[in-house]
Interface confidence: low
């Protein structure tokens, strides 16, 4: 092909090529042609004769102002036609007359201000019609019943002001899953407008200034329709009462989106008419008081989003939003509750009572004063089968005994990014019989004891990053009971002292994070009592991170038991000489990071075993000694390996001898060196 199109598997991509005409030298068997972002003004039908197999044609982002009816005659198999972002202004009855197999027609962002006659009458198979971002002033798309298989009609960002039954009755035989009317200036819903449509399942009216009054009228018009999904985000719905959604009583509404409405007052029984609702979006509102009956009637809601729905109006404590006890008791089927980023004063004793199916609860950054978690804090969740609880970013400073004893089903507990500072006696976790992960990273300080985790033997993931960990060197180890642990993160704790039995018995451990500590002394031969082999017995360890620990020595047998090690990170240490055979047992190693150390020599006897099956190597920023003895084997290996070595040319530079300083290692000439073959 003389054009620069890329062709793969019957798909031709000719986008962004400044084309002024359709290429005439593409394979004739292509089924998908992308001509977007070019300078096409016309689509001569003749140019497509050779591409009769096309099922998808995308000519978006061009300057096409007219379409030849014969185009589809040449493309009898065309299913998807995308004309978005062009300059079409008129559609005649002939325009798409031959496009009888279309399932998708995209006309968004053109200049179509009016639809005359019946340009879509032949599109009996059309599923999606996108006319958004045009200048349409009405929903009138024809004068006779048509588009019986249409499922998605997208009319957002037009100038539609009223919905009229006589304009929508062309859809009398259609089942619309999605009628998208967002970002229009709709001020009127004429009687019967939605009943004109055969079946309407989804209606989207986001960014339409409805307000409470027009919303109520809308809902009355939706009565006795098939509506399932209704989206009214950013529709200036500042208050709701027990009549706002009355019309929806005669529907089976499943999803309601009222997000971004600055909703201030949610009156009692506002949603009593929605017993079928399953998904309810209320995020980004301004509710000042949730009454005990505000959510009454929502018996089938599975998912409720209340993120940033309760925010304080001023710095005054009196202006804090209120949630009455038992407000959620109606939500018997609720499984997922998001209450992130709110200004709720605290958790009352019956705040969550009645949520008998709740599985996921996010209370991240939800409270203004949740300093201490007591054995009463979560009593209202006692009958909830909660699996995941997120309590991050709440300035929690203390967890008292039995704080979670009500949550016997809990599997994931996230307490990260708080201000917890205390000794962990182990009683904090009592009752967490099914706990799988506890995330405690980024807290003030945690002092461990031998029983800190004695009551959670089921724990598989424990995250203790940057918690100023104390007593980690106590014996027996605080981690001894955690025989099922697979992930342990102890990074960023400035740990200097640990015993060789710290990880004893953790035979299932797969990931161990110890980066950013101060463990250098432990591996020094001069250490009193000799090096500390704290990695012994970890036969299933897959990932080991020891970055930034100040190591300048590695004992020869320190990795001896790590037969399944796949990734090891020893970057940002002070390693110079590594003992021969240190990596001998790492036959499964896939990734080795030694960047920013003081390594001068890369010899086969040290690195040969580690490099054998490596897919990724990072030894950037080491002061390599470019002599035959030090790097000849390495250079030959580099030039023959399939291992990925990022920035090999720029960040693997010789430091010595002086005449090689700054010279790329990979260009070092090994031809005069003896015995440097990388593979024998």
């Amino acid at each position: 092909s003389t054009t620069k199109c890329t062709v793969s598997h019957e798909v031709a991509d000719c986008s962004h090529l400044k084309l002024t005409q359709v290429p005439d030298d593409l394979p004739t068997n292509i089924t998908v042609l992308n001509l977007t972002h070019n300078q096409l003004r016309r689509l001569p039908a003749a140019n497509f004769t050779r591409y009769s197999q096309l099922t998808s044609l995308d000519v978006g982002f061009n300057t096409i102002s007219k379409l030849e009816p014969e185009l589809c005659q040449k493309l009898p198999m065309l299913k998807v036609l995308n004309l978005q972002h062009n300059e079409l202004s008129q559609l005649s009855d002939k325009t798409f007359a031959f496009c009888t197999n279309l399932t998708e027609l995209h006309l968004m962002s053109n200049s179509i201000q009016k639809i005359k006659n019946n340009p879509f009458v032949k599109q009996k198979n059309l599923i999606t019609l996108d006319l958004s971002h045009n200048g349409l002033s009405s929903t009138k798309l024809g004068t006779q019943v048509q588009l019986e298989n249409l499922q998605e009609l997208l009319l957002s960002n037009n100038k539609i002001q009223a919905l009229k039954s006589e304009e929508l009755d062309i859809f009398a035989n259609s089942s619309l899953k999605k009628l998208e009317l967002s970002s229009n200036q709709i001020k009127e819903f004429s009687p019967g407008c939605f009943h004109a449509i055969g079946r309407l399942f989804g209606l989207f009216l986001n960014n339409v200034q409805l307000g409470p009054s027009l919303t109520e009228k809308l809902c009355l018009e939706l009565a006795n329709t098939s509506i399932r999904n209704l989206s009214l985000s950013n529709s200036q719905l500042s208050t709701t009462s027990n009549t706002t959604f009355l019309g929806l009583k005669w529907t089976n509404l499943t999803m309601l989106d009222l997000s971004y409405n600055n909703l201030n007052v949610v009156g009692n029984d506002s949603f009593a008419w929605l017993p079928q609702l399953e998904y309810f979006f209320l995020e980004y509102n301004n509710i000042q008081h949730l009454f005990s009956h505000s959510l009454h009637g929502l018996f089938n809601v599975r998912y409720l989003n209340l993120k940033r729905s309760f925010t304080k109006q001023s710095i005054s404590l009196a202006s804090l939003p209120k949630i009455d006890d038992f407000s959620f008791q109606w939500l018997k089927c609720l499984e997922h509750l998001n209450m992130e980023d709110n200004d709720i004063p605290g958790i009352k004793s019956n705040m969550f009572t009645g949520l008998i199916n709740l599985k996921y609860l996010s209370l991240s950054n939800s409270f203004t004063s949740l300093r201490t978690l007591t054995n009463e804090t979560f009593v209202s969740l006692a009958h909830s089968p909660l699996h995941i609880l997120n309590l991050t970013k709440n300035k929690i400073s203390k967890i008292e005994s039995d704080a979670f004893s009500w949550l016997g089903h809990l599997e994931v507990l996230d307490l990260g990014l708080n201000e917890i500072g205390q000794e962990l006696t182990g009683q904090e976790w009592r009752g967490l019989e099914n706990i799988f992960e506890i995330y405690l990273s980024y807290n003030k300080y945690l002092q461990l004891t031998r029983n800190s985790f004695a009551l959670v033997p089921s724990l598989q993931r424990l995250m203790l990053r940057r918690v100023a960990l104390k007593n980690v060197d106590s014996s027996p180890s605080p981690f001894q009971p955690l025989r099922n642990l697979t992930i342990l993160d102890l990074s960023n704790n400035n740990i200097a002292n640990i015993n060789d039995d710290m990880l004893e018995g953790l035979e299932k451990l797969e990931i161990l994070d110890l980066q950013h500590n101060n463990l250098a002394r432990l591996w020094k031969h001069a250490n009193p009592g000799g090096p500390i082999y704290f990695l012994k017995g970890l036969s299933h360890l897959h990932i080991l991170n020891l970055e930034s620990n100040g190591f300048d020595e590695i004992p020869v047998e320190v990795f001896k038991d790590l037969f399944e090690l796949k990734i090891i990170d020893l970057g940002l240490n002070n390693l110079n000489t590594l003992p021969a055979s240190v990596f001998n047992n790492q036959v499964s190693l896939k990734s080795l990071n030694l960047q920013k150390n003081l390594i001068t020599s890369v010899e086969k006897k040290v690195f040969g075993p580690a490099f054998r099956n490596l897919t990724e190597l990072d030894m950037r920023f080491n002061p390599f000694d470019c002599t035959c003895e030090s790097i000849a084997w390495f250079v030959n290996w580099i030039n023959e390996t399939h291992t990925n070595i990022p920035e090999l040319s720029s960040h693997y530079l010789c430091n010595t001898p002086p005449h090689y300083h700054g010279f790329p290692v990979r260009l070092f000439d090994t031809s005069s060196c003896k015995d440097s073959a990388p593979f024998e």
Epitope: T254, P275, Q276, E278, N300, N357, I388, E411, V412, S458
Partner: antibody, heavy 119, light 107 residues
Framework: QVQLVQSGAEVKKPGSSVKVSCKAS????????IHWVRQAPGQGLEWMGE????????NYNEKFKTRVTITADESTSTAYMELSSLRSEDTAVYYC????????????WGRGTLVTVSS | DIQMTQSPSSLSASVGDRVTITCRAS??????LAWFQQKPGKAPKSLIY???TLADGVPSRFSGSGSGTDFTLTISSLQPEDFATYYC?????????FGQGTKLEIK
């Protein structure tokens, strides 16, 4: 003890429809979702959809959405699965299953209904 | 949709053997994984739910593990009645797809 009793085997012609029933006893019918699973001869299990008998709310597997209709009659504690436009590859055992207090497993299963599609 | 990939598809073992079957999800299903046992001509039987909780009446030789995308069913010491086909199924979001099954046969 919860029991799910299914209707008997059926032989159907290609293009026709079949309606399989599943009657529950020994538990609260309306508060537990009923699921339908099928298994072609010698093949694995395939989840078709679920229904909340309390409100008729249904979640279908998209693969079957155009051809399957799941319904429930609370008064008789019976769930139904109707499959239309039958093809030979729809020959399978059709099971109904029910969740328990824990809604992340099926402790209760019907015995299955063999539907044979043959011309 | 989340796909479930089970391995191996068949397995020969002897009474007393330790057997491991794995199941991988194409997306994160948290802990919402169940294992079922099915014998010829019978409906499946629940063994394990929430990845590791034993269903009522299931012998302790059965155990489950894993989270996120990788899961394992282990039978610590095979008994004659354990020879059957085993399926994993996720319960995270519909469709609740099954693995393709692992047939456990007598060696």
């Amino acid at each position: 003890q919860v029991q799910l009793v299914q209707s008997g085997a059926e032989v159907k012609k290609p293009g026709s429809s079949v309606k399989v029933s599943c009657k529950a006893s020994g538990g609260t019918f309306s508060t537990y979702w009923i699921h339908w699973v099928r298994q072609a001869p010698g093949q694995g299990l395939e989840w078709m959809g679920e229904i909340n008998p309390n409100n008729g709310r249904i979640n279908y597997n998209e693969k079957f959405k155009t051809r399957v209709t799941i319904t429930a009659d609370e008064s008789t504690s019976t769930a139904y699965m109707e499959l239309s436009s039958l093809r030979s590859e729809d020959t399978a055992v059709y099971y109904c299953a029910r969740v328990g207090v824990m809604i992340t497993t099926f402790p209760y299963w019907g015995r299955g209904t063999l539907v044979t599609v043959s011309s | 949709d989340i796909q479930m990939t089970q391995s191996p598809s068949s397995l020969s073992a002897s009474v007393g053997d330790r057997v491991t079957i794995t199941c991988r999800a194409s997306g994160n299903i948290h802990n919402y994984l169940a294992w079922f046992q099915q014998k010829p001509g019978k409906a499946p039987k629940s063994l394990i739910y929430n990845a590791k909780t034993l269903a009522d009446g299931v012998p302790s030789r059965f155990s489950g593990s894993g989270s996120g995308t990788d899961f394992t069913l282990t039978i610590s010491s095979l008994q004659p009645e354990d020879f059957a086909t085993y399926y994993c199924q996720h319960f995270w979001s519909t469709p609740f797809t099954f693995g393709q099954g692992t047939k456990l046969e007598i060696k």
